[in-house]
Interface confidence: low
């Protein structure tokens, strides 16, 4: 959460001399209450915009717009405090509109905008517009708040932003997974055009449960340039456990721009249709085994094996 770096912060408009200032989110009117205070904003509109920074990066920004109520209290309106709170971190950023001239009624409703709060993909924010001065203790509130959820990097508009591209939003691996004979899965995906390694994370589950019954990790070394954009095919051997039939395949890239934090892509294979009278599972055969510390399974022979090749 930050302000867009290089834009001149402007809030003046015809009939109003105004300046934008950084704010500590604690306006002086909290400490020194005034008798006469303005009413709250009438409407707050928030939408997502994309702006370029001074060095050409594209970042998502919140476009905040609000209007004033058409009552006499605008005579006491000295400005506004805009506050953006990132809900998962409690981080808050504020700016203050300081009116350098008195507001007067004119032929259309006063409207204000601000588009300089840089936000993160897939985060929720609470945006508050507080008219200044703030009310006396127990006075009528003169602010309005709205929550806004910034879309994730799958969203078309977000895909081209720098934070999304840096985390791998342009890469579409187009994963396909097919079940082979002899307890094997064939995973195929498109390599990106960077010499970097990938990991395939296989997690298997019983039909209707969310506790894993098998986990396996397979490493794919960095492709050579002539293999960029080619399909990589990997055959994973599953554990022979009846009922351990729903498989989630997750591919984690390690691109230079995002290292361990790149966007992961996944695909799921559902269990085959259950027959009317399911084959009984012997009660001594566990669906899954307890993990031993941080290692994989105790019995090495029980681990999955795999091999892969890049397909041209």
């Amino acid at each position: 959460l930050r302000l867009l770096d290089h834009r001149a912060l402007v809030c003046s408009q015809p009939g109003l001399n105004c300046t934008v200032k950084n704010s500590t989110c604690l306006d002086d009117s909290w400490i020194h209450p005034r008798n006469l205070t303005p009413s709250s904003p009438k409407n707050i509109y928030i939408n997502l915009s994309v702006s370029s920074t001074q060095h050409g990066e594209l970042v998502p920004v919140l476009h905040v717009e609000w209007t004033l109520q058409t009552d006499a209290s605008i005579l006491y309106l000295e400005g506004a405090e805009l506050s953006v709170l990132q809900l998962n971190t409690n981080e808050r950023l504020c700016v203050r509109f300081e009116f350098l001239s008195k507001l007067r009624h004119h032929h259309r409703r006063w409207r204000f905008t601000f588009s300089h709060f840089v936000v993160d993909p897939d985060q929720e924010y609470e945006v508050t517009v507080h008219h200044l001065p703030k009310p006396i203790p127990d006075g009528d509130p003169n602010h309005q708040s709205k929550n806004f959820l910034v879309p994730d990097c799958e969203h078309a508009r977000m895909k081209v932003t720098t934070p999304c591209m840096s985390s791998g939003s342009l890469w579409d691996p187009n994963i396909t997974v097919e079940t082979l004979e002899a307890h094997q899965l064939r995973v195929s995906f498109t390599l990106w055009n960077e010499s970097t390694h990938y990991q395939i994370l296989l997690t298997s589950f019983p039909h209707m449960e969310n506790h894993s019954c098998f986990e396996h990790m397979h490493h794919i070394p960095a492709p050579r340039p002539e293999e960029f954009h080619q399909r990589s095919n990997v055959t994973l051997t599953l554990r022979n456990l009846k009922g351990c039939c729903r498989h989630q395949v997750q591919i984690q890239p390690f691109f230079s721009s995002c290292l361990n934090d790149c966007l992961r892509h996944s695909a799921t294979v559902s269990c085959p249709e259950m027959p009317d009278t399911p084959e009984p599972i012997p009660d001594y055969m566990p669906l899954w085994e307890p993990r031993s510390g941080s290692s994989d399974y105790k019995d090495d022979d029980d681990k999955g094996s795999s091999h892969h090749h890049h397909h041209h």
């Epitope: 994309v50 370029s52 060095h55 050409g56 078309a156 591209m165 840096s166 342009l170 960077e194 721009s257």
Partner: antibody, heavy 126, light 113 residues
Framework: QVQLVQSGAEVKKPGASVKVSCKAS????????MHWVRQAPGQGLEWMGW????????DLAQRFQGRVTMTRDTSISTAYMELSRLRSDDTAVYYC???????????????????WGRGTLVTVSS | DIVMTQSPDSLAVSLGERATINCKTS????????????LAWYQQKPGQPLNLLIY???TRESGVPDRFSGSGSGTDFTLTISSLQAEDVAVYYC?????????FGPGTKVDIK
Amino acid sequence: QVQLVQSGAEVKKPGASVKVSCKASGYSFTDYYMHWVRQAPGQGLEWMGWMHPNSGGTDLAQRFQGRVTMTRDTSISTAYMELSRLRSDDTAVYYCARGGYCSTLSCSFYWYFDLWGRGTLVTVSS
Amino acid sequence: DIVMTQSPDSLAVSLGERATINCKTSQSVLYSSKNKNFLAWYQQKPGQPLNLLIYWASTRESGVPDRFSGSGSGTDFTLTISSLQAEDVAVYYCQQYYSTPFTFGPGTKVDIK
């Protein structure tokens, strides 16, 4: 070889629309941003905006917002720029230009233009 | 928007002599944390595509003869042709790519004296 080939000259009436095409060859079309720049007769160069061929995302100069649409067809490595509600002062040569390399995920947003089309003359006259 | 100005509007130089073109930006195009100036120079010959000569204010594009050089920082930049050749007759433009909208200088026409 690496080149951008643009469509031929157009004569349009005021109020009409024009769609200029730019076919890329010799490089990976989706790895570079495509920009459009115009030059009115005897005037300088004016940047109109860019399009990201992989996603179709665009960023337009403010004065063209609402009148310019940038699209692409990745199957034929072609970018398009459509300008609507034409006025006589839209008479200009319209260039496509490549800029902003995106071969890895740490994309370059450094938009100098290293490859240009020859330009398409659009004349707006009643 | 960043406003670009160029001087002179045109110049005529004898073959083999030095030609110097100046470009001024209305605000600095130096991005200090990268220590790079976001400025490029282009050549435009009649009926031909524009040609990138210099980027980052001083980096020569591959294939561009070494008689072309760029210098300057912040708001003041120069393109120098150390020994003018007949094929250098053209209009030369500077461009900032520091912030959108990207803007170009009005151009400088170079002729043979």
